[in-house]
Interface confidence: low
């Protein structure tokens, strides 16, 4: 339905809070390097804009987009050629060019400085002087760091935030109280970002259709009781919803969402039974909840679908007279029975079924030569399975840091000419899927691992478009959205990879390293395993764990002295010496 | 980054009275709130007094009264006024900074109340 202004519209549904909110994110978002104080001063300016939309809709510019008063607004920025450089060019384009051209420049590794937490104390003060600024500036930092973040979702995250402070500023010990809400915020956010990325990348690089395909089988698996026409229904919304928030139609895309929130509460004795205490919440949490709702038990009484799908004469005919919808249903019923698989399994599946169709449905005998089909998925379903049991086993044998070090050594080996800060982040990152995953009851090990596995390898895959240097990853990151992670693992020793000067200054080591958490010094260790495999990459796993754990005794030897900068000094010419013999 | 030196510490004896100044620069036009923290020997950091731009103050209870903030938006420079000083009084004081909370801080300088 059309309104005569859209941003009046979109103030009316939202509220002046989450209008305000929103907007504030989408500036983040797109103009990543712009003091706080700047992007509040837009804020208000457009917030007071709306308003007078709302009270005289046919005021002066109140027809226009959102993307043109938007855009208008952030080409106001006096500084925008000194900060962004090209992206200053953006504002010499008109709608819809202007918006692609900002997207194009949102950066996913922003030139910003980690975030340091005050004292428990500071925040506190700060909390109770001036609440708002406070929360303003927590989605304005949270925005300009994660560009894709799920606009909406961080509303929820702020309200936590929000909640934890007036909760533990109250309390006794603040810090006991406060500190692991912030840090499950923090993990969570990042986890939530990260997932949000895959979907957003999902959408650009592969199209609606990769990603209606990703939310049919997850949405199946969701809600095994619910009919095809239903899932397809919530599909459709869900796709509207996530291509305007990747787009940065963020207004647009919180509004979707509280009406598909809104029409999944109406609706759920048609969805699943698994709704009722999400619906009887605020609407952030609401939403919030349905998203992670738990997948509905299965209908008892599920047919084979061999019957359909390898069995009937009808097959070529139906799959001919609406190829996707066919499709569609094939992985709907599969992915129902099937909550034990992976997304990524259930869509490579899908793909094979497709692929046999495609080739029976123009033979001689089309029955007789897709009559196997199904036979045919067993390598895909063992390859993941295999793949998780193995990892899992080393997990629980090496624990998590010695296990992020084993990735770390397998996926310097496979790509050596990614940047080692990038090699860190994303083995680390793939190395927590064993405390996330590996505990899990089995019926629940390979969706997890497989689908966060795609998350982590995504991030890898957009930090290497920002800067390409391995065909390799380019290939497997853009031949194939289903079949990224099959194609990572599949990757061997680069034999074509020259191996990296030898760089003294790489491995050497300072007391400073003594003060470091815990968490910072094995990213320290980590950093220079990387270094060691780019300079070696035949090193067997021996050689390497040896220099290993003799770093690890040189740092706690001098960490220990009483002159630890004198010891580091010494002992770090030393530890290099044998280090280099040790791999030579 | 902002800068921030503090000065004024030094020997009192208790009821006395002492003026710290702290003096910022860097990128100063974003800070907002200028405060004092101290610490004693093996204690956590407190908070003593804080001042917004627009010179709003406030102060815990074991302070109120006695000492007082103010702050020269033209020098960039705050001071905390101490008077009845006590020997609980003791400790290195921290001048702190920031836009929406104190994420700069200075070295510090030492006040000793003894007799």
């Known amino acids: 339905d059309t309104h005569k202004s859209e941003v009046a519209h979109r103030f009316k549904d939202l509220g002046e809070e989450h209008f305000k909110g929103l907007v504030l994110v989408a500036f983040s978002q797109y103009l990543q390097q712009c003091p706080f104080e700047e992007h509040v001063k837009l804020v208000n300016e457009v917030t007071e804009f709306a308003k007078t939309c709302v009270a005289d809709e046919s005021a002066e510019n109140c027809d226009k987009s959102l993307h043109t008063l938007f855009g208008d607004k952030l080409c106001t920025v006096a500084t925008l050629r000194e900060t962004y450089g090209e992206m200053a060019d953006c504002c010499a384009k008109q709608e819809p060019e202007r918006n692609e051209c900002f997207l194009q420049h949102k950066d996913d590794n922003p030139n910003l400085p980690p975030l340091v937490r005050p004292e428990v104390d500071v925040m506190c003060t700060a909390f109770h002087d001036n609440e708002a600024t406070f929360l303003k500036k927590y989605l304005y930092e949270v925005a300009r760091r994660h560009p894709y973040f799920y606009a909406p979702e961080l509303l929820f995250f702020a309200a936590r935030y929000k909640a934890a402070f007036a909760e533990c500023c109250q309390a006794a010990d603040k810090a006991a109280c406060l500190l692991p809400k912030l840090d499950e915020l923090r993990d969570e956010g990042k986890a939530s970002s990260a997932k949000q990325r895959l979907k957003c990348a999902s959408l650009q690089k592969f199209g609606d259709r990769a990603f209606k395909a990703w939310a049919v089988a997850r949405l199946s698996q969701k809600f095994p009781k619910a009919e095809f026409a239903e899932v397809s229904k919530l599909v459709t919304d869900l796709t509207k919803v996530h291509t305007e928030c990747c787009h940065g139609d963020l207004l647009e895309c919180a509004d979707d969402r509280a009406d598909l929130a809104k029409y999944m509460c109406e609706n759920q004795d048609s969805i699943s039974s698994k709704l009722k205490e999400c619906c009887d919440k605020p609407l952030l949490e609401k939403s919030h909840c349905l998203a992670e709702v738990e997948n509905d038990e299965m209908p008892a009484d599920l047919p084979s679908l061999a019957a359909d799908y390898v069995e009937s004469k009808d097959v070529c005919k139906n799959y001919a007279e609406a190829k996707d919808v066919f499709l569609g249903m094939f992985l709907y019923e599969y992915a129902r029975r099937h909550p034990d698989y992976s997304v990524m399994l259930l869509l490579r599946l899908a793909k094979a079924y497709e692929a046999t169709l495609e080739k029976c449905c123009a033979a001689a005998d089309p029955h007789e030569c897709y009559a196997k089909v199904f036979d045919e998925f067993q390598p895909l379903v063992e390859e993941p399975q295999n793949l998780v049991k193995q990892n899992c086993e080393l997990f629980e044998q090496l624990g998590e840091y010695k296990f992020q070090n084993a990735l770390l050594v397998r996926y310097t080996k496979k790509v050596p000419q990614v940047s080692t800060p990038t090699l860190v982040e994303v083995s680390r990152n793939l190395g927590k899927v064993g405390a996330k995953c590996c505990k899990l009851p089995e019926a629940k090990r390979m969706p997890c691992a497989e689908d966060y596995l795609s998350v982590v390898l995504n991030r890898l895959c957009v930090l290497h478009e920002k800067t390409p240097v391995s065909e390799k990853v380019t290939k497997c990151c853009t031949e194939s959205l289903v079949n990224r992670r099959p194609c990572f693992s599949a990757l061997e020793l680069d034999e074509a990879y020259v191996p990296k000067a030898f760089n003294a200054e790489t491995f050497t080591f300072h007391a400073d390293m003594c003060t470091l958490s815990e968490k910072e010094k094995q990213v320290k260790k980590q950093t220079a395993l990387v270094e060691l495999v780019k300079h070696k990459p035949k090193a067997t796993k021996e050689q390497l764990k040896g220099v290993m754990d003799n770093f690890a005794a040189f740092v706690e030897k001098c960490c220990k002295a009483d002159d630890k900068e004198a010891c580091f000094a010494e002992e770090g010419p030393k530890f290099v010496a044998a280090s280099q013999a040790a791999l030579a | 980054q902002v800068q921030l030196v503090e000065s004024g510490g030094g020997l009192v004896q208790p009821g006395g009275s002492l003026r710290l100044s702290c003096a910022a620069s860097?990128?100063?036009?974003?800070?907002?709130?200028m405060a004092w923290y101290r610490q004693a020997p093996g204690q956590q950091r407190e908070f003593v007094a804080r001042i917004s731009k627009g010179g709003s103050t406030n102060y815990p209870d074991s302070v109120k009264g006695r000492f007082t903030i103010s702050r020269d938006n033209a020098k960039n420079t705050v001071y905390l006024q101490m008077n009845s000083l006590r020997a609980e009084d003791t400790a290195v004081y921290y001048c702190a900074a920031g836009p929406v909370w104190e994420q700069f801080w200075g070295q510090g300088t030492l006040v000793t109340v003894s007799s």
């Open positions: 860097g990128s100063i036009e974003s800070i907002n709130r």
